[in-house]
Every structure is written in C-alpha cells, then in structure tokens.
C-alpha cells in the first residue's frame, strides 16, 4: 500500500553508507562486478535492491543491501519491475553505487524520500 | 543485546481496541522494517502487517482497515493499534525484524496473548 | 493467496535420524531465479526461529545439519542428524506475493 514518505533519518543512512562505499573504495569495488542499470525515475530502492541482490560475496555491499531490503520488505508487483530496469544496460557497481548516491542525495535535498 | 520486547496485551471484549508495543535493542532500528505476525493457540503462523524504514506500510485483507503498524525510530519501537476486534483475532502477537522477501524475519520477540472474548 | 502446503503435519523420529519435511507451495514462488522460501523452527512456548532464507540458504548461526532445497513450487527441509535439540515445530513461508503466507506446520517429536 502507498504510504507516507520515507523519515530522513533512514535515507540519511542509506546515504551515509554509500558516501562510505565511495570513500574507502581502494580495489575495484565487488571485484568490478556488473549490476544491471536502473530505471532512477520510479521505485528506486526497489530497482536498486534488485539489481544489488544478485551481487553475492561483497562484503563492502552487504550493508547496503540490508538497508535497501529496509526500504523495500515487500515485493512490488510483478509488472512494475520492467519498468526498473534499464533493458540489457549492465555497469559496475562502483559506478551503480555513485549514480545511486546522486539521486538519492537529489531526493534528500529535495524532500522527495519516497 | 540484541533483543525484540513486546507488550500491551490483555483481554478485550469483541469490537475493542488494544495497543500492542515492540521495544528494539542492540541494532539499528531505523534501517530495518518490522512486521507483526500472529499465531492463535494450538495454530500456525499468520502474517499481520510490515512496515518499511520508510514508514510504507504492508497488511493482509483480514485485517487491513481494522489494524494499523506505525513505528517511532526515535524510541527505537513498533506498533500495533488493534480496533474492531473480533474472537478469531484471539492470538499470540510477535513482533519481528523483517529482512525483506530476500531474507525473511530474521528476529522474533517472545510474543504478548490478546484474548478477545466477551 | 498463495498457499504453503507442509507434509508431513507430524512425524516421529529418533536421535541421529535424518528427517524430511516438504512444503509445496499453490503456485511458483521463483523471482529472478531466486526462490523466495524461508524456514523456521519453533519450540513450544516460544519464539520461532529462521533457519534457512530463499530456499537454501542457512541463516548465521545455524547448525549445518540443516539444509534446505527446491524451486518453483516444492521445497524441502532437510536435518541430516536429528539432535535432541531440533524436537520442535517447522514452518515454511514465502515471500514472492503479499500477502505472506505460512506453512501449517510440521511437529517433530521423539519416536
């Protein structure tokens, strides 16, 4: 059910870790695996967690994998995840984790946490 | 420690309300959702409502406008405001730290009996 | 809704017995390639407990006598050694459609 906005405090965390992510970030993250690209106009914690779900083995991701399963407990609907995903576009999540954190950085100055 | 409280059961007449509270500790409680789920006595488990770290909130059709889940990430606490009680909502309620549909209730609370019954 | 169908509803076995219990579900729970199948363990008079999350994955700090496997619709909870410790009830739940929805339960007790 649709609902009131995210509190900041939980975006001010999920962003705060990939702040972190981006900082510490000495190898290639998650041994330069790739994630598929996402829709960031709809549903982003969900397209997010989808995409990062299929990541195993990275610790330096886990953190933020919870917290995006935080945000989305429950699965959206089963035809709302093709408009998630940008079609057959895959990019490291090194890169997937700066473009999250722009947009969400966007959302956070703009208000806009749902 | 890391630990899951619940409280505010009781006995409540058929179309009462009762409050029931989950008091968290030993993790970050904002960054998780937290759900309720049930159990009436000698039976299995039922799902009664999930809210996200974004205050979304998720509930069943059997008790969806009836019940509703709301959390205070400053108190680090769950709740669950029961109105419109009826005898087949006669359980054990647990509270729960919901990892999402990719990982499961991953903590539970003892459990608090409401008993509705005139 | 989907439905979780557990077999058996009770069995009873003796220490060091490997045990089998089975949950189907009323239609596929498979997303992504993932199955979204979770199993607990409840002893009376308390809290149940996760063991294994998306169908075979044990969860931190369980015994590796437990195991679990499947997709689509049947799944299995396998103890490879019963210990005195496991005499308890087993639910499976999904989470690949709201609303979520349990097993009936399958209660282990000693033979």
């Known amino acids: 059910s649709p609902s009131p906005v995210p509190p900041s405090t939980a975006l001010k965390e999920l962003i705060e870790e990939l702040v972190n992510i981006t900082q510490n970030q000495k190898a290639p993250l998650c041994n330069g695996s790739m994630v598929w690209s996402i829709n960031l106009t709809a549903g982003v914690y969900c397209a997010a967690l989808e995409s990062l779900i299929n990541v195993s083995g990275c610790s330096a991701i886990e953190k933020t994998q919870r917290m995006l399963n935080g945000f989305c407990p429950h699965k959206v609907s089963a035809g709302q995840f093709s408009s998630l995903r940008v079609r057959d576009t895959k990019i490291e999540v090194a890169q997937f984790v700066k473009d999250l954190l722009v947009h969400l950085k966007k959302l956070f100055r703009e208000g806009q946490f749902n | 420690e890391v630990q899951l409280v619940e409280s505010g059961g009781g006995l409540v007449q058929p179309g009462g309300s009762l409050r029931l509270s989950c008091a968290a500790s030993?993790?970050?409680?904002?960054?998780?959702?937290m759900s309720w789920v049930r159990q009436a006595p000698g039976k299995g488990l039922e799902w009664v409502a999930s809210i996200s770290s974004g205050d979304t909130t998720y509930y069943p059709d059997s008790v969806k406008g009836r019940f509703t889940i709301s959390r205070d990430n400053a108190k680090n606490s769950l709740y669950l405001q029961m109105n419109s009680l009826r005898a087949e909502d006669t359980a054990v309620y647990y509270c729960a730290r919901n990892e999402g549909y990719y990982f499961g209730l991953t903590l539970w609370g003892q459990g608090t009996l409401v008993t509705v019954s005139s | 809704d989907i439905q979780m169908t557990q077999s058996p509803s009770s069995l009873s076995a003796s220490v060091g017995d490997r045990v089998t219990i089975t949950c189907k579900a009323s239609e596929s729970v498979d997303h992504f390639g993932w199955s979204l199948v979770h199993w607990y363990q409840q002893k009376p008079g308390k809290a149940p407990k996760l063991l294994i999350y998306?169908?075979?994955n044990l969860e931190s700090g369980v015994p590796s006598r437990f195991s679990g496997s499947g997709s689509g619709t049947d799944f299995t909870l396998t103890i490879s050694s019963l210990q005195p410790e496991d005499f308890a009830t087993y639910y499976c739940q999904q989470s690949n459609e709201d609303p979520w929805t349990f097993g009936g339960g399958t209660k282990v007790e000693i033979k």
């Open positions: 030993g993790f970050t409680f904002s960054s998780y959702a």
């Open positions: 998306r169908a075979s």
